[in-house]
Amino acid sequence: MDSFNYTTPDYGHYDDKDTLDLNTPVDKTSNTLRVPDILALVIFAVVFLVGVLGNALVVWVTAFEAKRTINAIWFLNLAVADFLSCLALPILFTSIVQHHHWPFGGAACSILPSLILLNMYASILLLATISADRFLLVFKPIWCQNFRGAGLAWIACAVAWGLALLLTIPSFLYRVVREEYFPPKVLCGVDYSHDKRRERAVAIVRLVLGFLWPLLTLTICYTFILLRTWSRRATRSTKTLKVVVAVVASFFIFWLPYQVTGIMMSFLEPSSPTFLLLKKLDSLCVSFAYINCCINPIIYVVAGQGFQGRLRKSLPSLLRNVLTEESVVRESKSFTRSTVDTMAQKTQAV
């Protein structure tokens, strides 16, 4: 996405004062921002505030427990991925306010917008790792007793981060800045040198590896887990199912518009009306995907409150209960130790 515009406005009434600041839009032919851009700005602002504070809190809570609690390692890595992505938001916000003018240089253009994709791949690979851990706890408890340790968890996280970085490279390499003479603007976007095949390949790989394949595998994985846990339980809690569905679904819900528009744009001609419409929605789709970066802490807090009644404890205390409860590896107890433990296991799929 973030492909460059192909249209040039009419300059008949152009009267630009060359200055490029937040108060003076560079394109005087359209002073006001489009509605999708305004919505994107609102989402970015909320995500930044909630994401930075929420994930910082999660990092703070889990960092102390990461040496001894495997669950804390998973949550710590997810929070770091989200927190990193949130750091790019003020820059992206500023760019949209300036009608997508990018005064931050080529290096920032390559790195900052790529952070959300790094987050996508890191999150989904960490989710896959966490899901594998959940699966093994249920189906291979003896193996877990013998081999499941903090060291292995950190190695798994390192592999996930490494793969995520590799998968983000295409976006990083194809991102360039381009100058427009009228209206005066520097644009940051992906440039495939008009090679539609290359653009499609990148979009398809992103869709398959970042969305469809994880969706399939996680769905199967949690179906098996839930079937097993239900069969071992007297009271079949729909609450557990709701939490699992919520945390697994959030990733896919918020990435769906980005993935759909991205794949569509790669197959459409840049001059087509549909492409131009989707181009206008680009920032909104990116901002919607960015909700992933703040949703996890919200889910942890809401779920924590739900399982503990009223919010009687402090936020860090509540989060500590939700995020650092260690799993019991004996199969019969792995999902029945406590409702809080159930929550801890389920939210790892966020």
Partner: antibody, heavy 118, light 106 residues
Framework: QIQLVQSGPELKKPGETVKISCKAS????????MSWVKQTPGKGLKWMGW????????ANADDFKGRFAFSLETSASTAYLQINNLKNEDTATYFC???????????WGQGTTLTVSS | ENVLTQSPAIMSASPGEKVTITCSAS?????MHWFQQKPGTSPKLWIY???NLASGVPTRFSGSGSGTSYSLTISRMEAEDAATYYC?????????FGGGAKLEIK
């Protein structure tokens, strides 16, 4: 280093067509717009318009609409200026110039002298 | 369009002398750019965004101004500075150039 190399001088008759080329090297061609500037001894420098080298969308100045066309061959990093139905007043030197978003032209071609005479 | 008027149109200066070329715009502009052109060559970017010297331009050159009045100054004239200088704006459409100021060495 950055260079804009233009095609050689042209001698044409009124009514004919001329196509002047401007080959860019030393930078990413599609990253900057390309402007065309006309210079005549009597009237000095006059901006003719520019072409968006990424999209290929041209924008002509009001005085250069109709007979003047800007085009690209992106794969060859080359911009073209075509003038149809040449007139005597088209006799001038034509420059291509790399256009910066903050308003100036930082690199210029060496110029192509066009003489229109019957 | 925004008409740029340069003055003086032609001037001679002795080596070491201070030289000022002015550029007056018919309507206000934010930035002025200056080009140097010698006979038989293409214009060279000399000063951009009112006061920034282009790469390789000697520090004896400076630019200033605001609104409708801008100037290019040479603190100490040298033989190699003999050329025609053009001002240019892009604050209003279309971009326009001044008529040029021819600077000769005495």
């Amino acid at each position: 280093q950055i260079q804009l190399v233009q095609s050689g001088p042209e001698l044409k008759k009124p009514g004919e067509t001329v196509k002047i080329s401007c080959k860019a090297s030393g930078y990413t061609f599609t990253a900057y717009g390309m402007s065309w500037v006309k210079q005549t001894p009597g009237k000095g420098l006059k901006w003719m318009g520019w072409i968006n080298t990424y999209s290929g969308v041209p924008a002509n100045a009001d005085d250069f609409k109709g007979r003047f066309a800007f085009s690209l061959e992106t794969s060859a990093s080359t911009a073209y200026l075509q003038i149809n139905n040449l007139k005597n007043e088209d006799t001038a030197t034509y420059f291509c110039a790399r256009s910066r978003y903050d308003g100036y032209f930082d690199y210029w071609g060496q110029g192509t002298t066009l003489t229109v005479s019957s | 369009e925004n008409v740029l008027t340069q003055s003086p149109a032609i001037m001679s200066a002795s080596p070491g002398e201070k030289v000022t070329i002015t550029c007056s715009a018919s309507s206000s502009v934010s930035y002025m750019h200056w080009f140097q052109q010698k006979p038989g060559t293409s214009p060279k970017l000399w000063i951009y965004s009112t006061s920034n010297l282009a790469s390789g331009v000697p520090t004896r050159f400076s630019g200033s101004g605001s609104g409708t009045s801008y100037s290019l100054t040479i603190s100490r004239m040298e033989a190699e500075d003999a050329a025609t200088y053009y001002c240019q704006q892009r604050s209003s459409y279309p971009p326009t150039f001044g008529g040029g100021a021819k600077l000769e060495i005495k």
